[in-house]
């Protein structure tokens, strides 16, 4: 609460996160023309990336384009991309939606459709829907440990959210354990009124707000964090503004001296840890 | 404008960026002693990295050192690094400019020059100029979509820069479309009074400032962002302070059971999105 | 100092860091059943990652699990993980400490111990201590150049920590050169009252605070940074809260058409650059 006699100072903060959990992923795998069910295990090194303190990312879904090489090929026949003659294809043109540079030729994509030929990583990425349900939907049961060190330099005061008395096997709960800093991802979504299973398909951004309202006067000292959660991406966003949260990255390799790559379109939840608050002292 | 009767509160912000664009790169490629022109396509997975919200990086230029292995070799003969006898080379010495640890021997680098032998990733990186013009100079035509969610927790008010009424095929323009949040990289530089083609060679840091001056009183409510742009790195910086913006990263692989790497010195633009402002309410 | 007649404004900041240094690492390497001493050189591309401005990471230690493949194998026999019969192993169970999903079978780990079989990246990571002394303990002699650009938009004032008069071969010293922005990592630790050699084993988080107390009135103008250092992770932290600083990442590759990975548990120092302060003007 506002104490007008106090000198207020904004918080200086540093955050460290640690995600735990394993996901079993079942998907159709095609090898040598034969499609069979494949099972694989994803651990932290597979689904998360060494990211900076105030954010962490958990991959919940993906689409792979394997064995791409740099060459010429027909572009993907998405809506409006088909052609019937070379006139429709403009040499040197880069359609922002496309994945390559047009050569000016209209070539067969499959038995029924023709598209503009492009210089690109081929075969070009198929613009298919993200798998539903999400491949790593079990990430709902992953947990994240959040360590937060704060400082009010003007008051020369430092503290952290984890106290020596805390128990490392706790799980945050708004009522029963509001000071525990180990959070189950599914609980974060529930607290924010969101459905993890749904968001996991396309990805999204979730805010974990840590509010420090600190009274640093010795006679009524109080300085503990309050956690709250809210979704940061717009779930009602128009297609043209890229709803959800995804990014593409590539694994490069050489095969028979040819540079190849596997392109991964990774969907997931980016968690932003937003620390704010003030320290007041007479 | 300052309304002294209002309670002001700083903005809590989360940012999400999405870069679009394809670059065609033409460079000399040497294979089996033969040098020829090579054409390749770079898409988002090739020129950008999964980075945190408030920054994104676009590679505009690079220098590659391919097929390095850990062994002994002469170091690169940069200014002041040549030797005529072993006396000039100090066993165990690591010159901060060098890429390895000296063995104490002075050995031939080429027919005319001798340098100190080092234990390093060999052959050591040649200290050659960044290619001019920049290899991905066409990145000037890339676009970035910036999504910004803001919150004034004390006023329990949340909004975002993208409104449902907005058009996903717009491009920001200071006069014609100042609320569009899709920016052409070249336009950002133009607005900041900088030359993209020039900066792309050595790299640089560009600030995209988003200023929210929010009046949250119901009778005169206003809360929309204002975008401005300024260069953050010092273009007049002395050589010793490493002008521009670059970093090195490596792709590791095995060949005939020998661990090798390709070292990439990536030059590019780091865009920092700096969100600030206040929300005031009676 | 507080000048009550001034209009104060918080600083808007952008940071760029550049680490320099080479480490020689000596460790036991096993090949074909023979263990011998291996020497390798680590340069910036090997021990640091392209990270965002306000943080940088220097790897000081690591544990590798090479050639992991997705299959079934006994889990690592850490405390409390051994079994004597299948009853102790629960099909489908994921122990948060484990690295896989139990099959329900109790199988031999070695001649004396049995553990639950898991579907995982095999062989599972051995939970061994981080090497002591740290493999890259010589990182103490690395240096980091910190470039900081600041802005007070309300006062339309911009400056940076590096001035044209500065010497690029300086090293920061609290007394002799407090404005130099090239820092030796070991000195940062010494200033913070910490032992680099010790922290390098398990990793940690170090704060570099840059305080700008700017008087922007023309008659008594002053605006230069003050640097200070403090450790941000809790060195007395209970085991259950994961002391130090480490993360796991993987290098994936294919061998005989089998997807494999090398898992690296990287320990190191994350340096957080915390910029704060105000600009005051009449």
């Amino acid at each position: 609460s506002d104490k007008l006699y106090q000198r207020k100072e904004p918080v200086i903060s540093s955050v460290h996160t640690k995600v735990k959990g394993i996901a079993e992923v079942t998907e159709n795998v095609t090898e040598g023309g034969v499609t069979k069910l494949g099972h694989s295990i994803f651990d932290t090194a597979d689904y998360t990336f060494p990211l900076q303190g105030n954010s962490f990312f958990v991959m919940t879904n993906y689409v792979k384009s394997e064995g791409q090489v740099q060459t010429l090929c027909p572009e993907y026949p998405r809506r409006g991309a088909q052609c019937s003659s070379d006139r429709r294809c403009k040499k040197g043109w880069m359609d922002p939606q496309s994945k390559g540079i047009q050569t000016g030729r209209c070539v067969p994509y499959d038995k029924t459709r023709k598209t503009c030929e492009v210089s690109a990583w081929c075969p070009t990425e198929e613009e298919k829907e993200a798998p539903r349900p999400a491949l790593l939907r079990s990430a709902e049961n992953f947990t994240v440990l959040i360590k937060n060190n704060i400082h009010f330099p003007g008051h020369n005061y430092t503290t952290r959210n984890i106290l020596p008395t805390m128990n490392g096997s706790c799980t945050f709960h708004k009522t029963w354990d509001p000071q525990c800093s180990i959070f189950r991802l599914g609980d974060i979504f529930q607290e924010a009124g969101e459905n993890f299973t749904e968001v996991a398909v396309q990805g999204g951004i979730m805010g974990i707000e840590i509010y420090w309202d600190c009274n640093l006067d010795s006679w009524s000292h109080h300085c503990r964090p309050r956690y709250s959660f809210r979704r940061l991406d717009d779930k009602n966003m128009d297609e043209s503004f890229v709803p959800g949260y995804n990014f593409r990255y590539a694994k490069y390799y050489k095969e028979n001296n040819v540079e190849k790559r596997t392109l991964i379109k990774a969907f997931g939840i980016r968690f932003d840890i937003l620390v704010f608050g003030t320290g007041g002292k007479f | 404008s300052d309304k002294l009767y209002q309670r002001k509160e700083p903005v809590i912000s989360s940012v999400h960026t999405k870069v679009k664009g394809i670059a065609e790169v033409t460079e000399n490629v040497t294979e089996g002693g033969v040098t020829k022109l090579g054409h390749s396509i770079f898409d988002t997975a090739d020129y950008t990295f999964p980075l945190q919200g408030n920054s994104f990086f676009v590679m505009t230029n690079y220098v590659k050192s391919e097929g390095q292995v850990q062994t002994l070799c002469p170091e690169y003969p940069r200014r002041g690094a040549q030797c005529s006898s072993d006396r000039r080379c100090k066993k165990g010495w690591m010159d901060p400019q060098s890429k390895g640890i000296q063995t104490g021997r002075c050995v031939p680098y080429d027919k005319t020059r001798k340098t100190c032998e080092v234990s390093a990733w060999c052959p050591t990186e040649e200290e050659k100029e960044a290619p001019r013009p920049a290899l991905l100079r066409s990145a000037e035509n890339f676009t970035v979509l910036i999504k910004n969610n803001i919150h004034f927790p004390g006023h329990n008010y949340t909004t975002r820069n993208i409104l449902p009424t907005m058009n996903g095929s717009c491009t920001f323009h200071k006069t014609w479309d100042p609320q569009c949040s899709i920016f052409r990289l070249g336009d950002i530089f133009q607005e900041a009074g900088e030359n993209f083609t020039e900066v792309a060679v050595q790299g640089g840091i560009m600030g995209i400032e988003i200023y929210w001056d929010c009046n949250l009183d119901s009778w005169s409510h206003h809360c929309r962002p204002r975008y401005s742009f300024r260069r953050l790195d010092d273009k007049n910086m002395d050589e010793s302070f490493v002008p521009g913006y670059n970093f090195r990263y490596a792709k590791y692989y095995k060949e005939n059971n020998v661990e090798k790497r390709t070292l990439i010195k990536a030059f590019g633009i780091r865009f920092d999105i700096l969100v600030f402002g206040t929300g005031g309410k009676f | 100092s507080d000048k009550l007649y001034q209009r104060k404004e918080p600083v808007i900041s952008s940071v760029h860091t550049k680490v320099k240094g080479i480490a020689e690492v000596t460790e036991n390497v096993t090949e074909g059943g023979v263990t011998k001493l291996g020497h390798s050189i680590f340069d910036t591309a090997d021990y640091t990652f392209p990270l965002q401005g306000n943080s940088f990471f220097v790897m000081t230690n690591y544990v590798k699990s090479e050639g992991q493949v997705q299959t079934l194998c006994p889990e690592y026999p850490r405390r409390g993980a051994q079994c004597s019969s299948d009853r102790r192993c629960k099909k489908g169970w994921m122990d948060p400490q484990s690295k896989g999903i139990q099959t329900g079978r109790c199988v031999p780990y070695d001649k004396t111990r049995k553990t639950c079989e898991v579907s995982a990246w095999c062989p599972t990571e051995e939970e061994k201590e981080a090497p002591r002394p740290a493999l890259l303990r010589s990182a103490e002699n690395f240096t980091v150049l910190i470039k900081n650009n600041i802005h007070f938009p309300g006062h339309n004032y911009t400056t940076r920590n590096i001035l044209p008069t500065m010497n690029g071969s300086c090293t920061f010293h609290k007394t002799w050169d407090p404005q130099c922005s090239i820092f030796r990592l070991g000195d940062i630790f010494q200033e913070a009252g910490e032992n680099f050699t010790e922290v390098a084993v398990q990793g940690g988080i170090m704060g570099i605070e840059i305080y700008w107390d700017c008087n922007l009135d023309s008659w008594s103008h002053h605006c230069r940074p003050r640097y200070s250092f403090r450790r941000l992770d809790d060195k007395n932290m209970d085991e259950s809260f994961v002391p130090g600083y480490n993360f796991r990442y993987a290098k994936y590759y294919k061998e005989n058409n089998v997807e494999k990975r090398t898992l690296i548990k990287a320990f190191g120092i994350r340096f957080d650059i915390l910029v704060f302060g105000t600009g005051g003007k009449f």
Partner: nanobody, 127 residues
Framework: EVQLVESGGGLVQAGGSLRLSCAAS????????MGWFRQAPGKLREFVAS????????RYIDSVEGRFTISRDNTKNTLYLQMNNLKAEDTAVYYC????????????????????YGQGTQVTVSS
């Protein structure tokens, strides 16, 4: 020094069966993975099957999967290869070897990860 002695080879008609044995002496090999390799005239030595130290996990080359079974008896320091439904292309000298490492799961099929190959036993399949 470890000695490995293979036995059980011979001439058999296509579709027939053989059981190869490999007896180890000189050191207990129960700590090691073990494997069978084969070499046909004019060809490189190729991996056939491998079994980890405990006998729990087995691996096979695709062409013998479902026809061959590798097993071991650690009490007798002996390795076995049961070969059913033999084909002409199975004709080769069969060698047993023990796995030196590292990482059996990853390297079970790599000849350089094995040591102390035996003298071999000839298997000839006539059609």
């Amino acid at each position: 020094e470890v000695q490995l002695v293979e036995s059980g080879g011979g001439l058999v008609q296509a579709g027939g069966s053989l059981r190869l044995s490999c007896a180890a002496s000189g050191r207990t090999v129960s700590d090691y993975g073990m494997g069978w390799f084969r070499q046909a005239p004019g060809k490189l030595r190729e991996f056939v099957a491998s079994i980890n130290w405990s006998g729990i996990y087995t691996r096979y080359i695709d062409s013998v999967e479902g026809r061959f079974t590798i097993s071991r008896d650690n009490t007798k320091n002996t390795l076995y290869l049961q070969m059913n439904n033999l084909k002409a292309e199975d004709t080769a000298v069969y060698y047993c070897a023990y796995f030196l490492g590292p990482n059996w799961y990853s390297n079970y099929g790599r000849p350089s990860s094995y040591d102390f190959y035996g003298q071999g036993t000839q298997v000839t399949v006539s059609s």
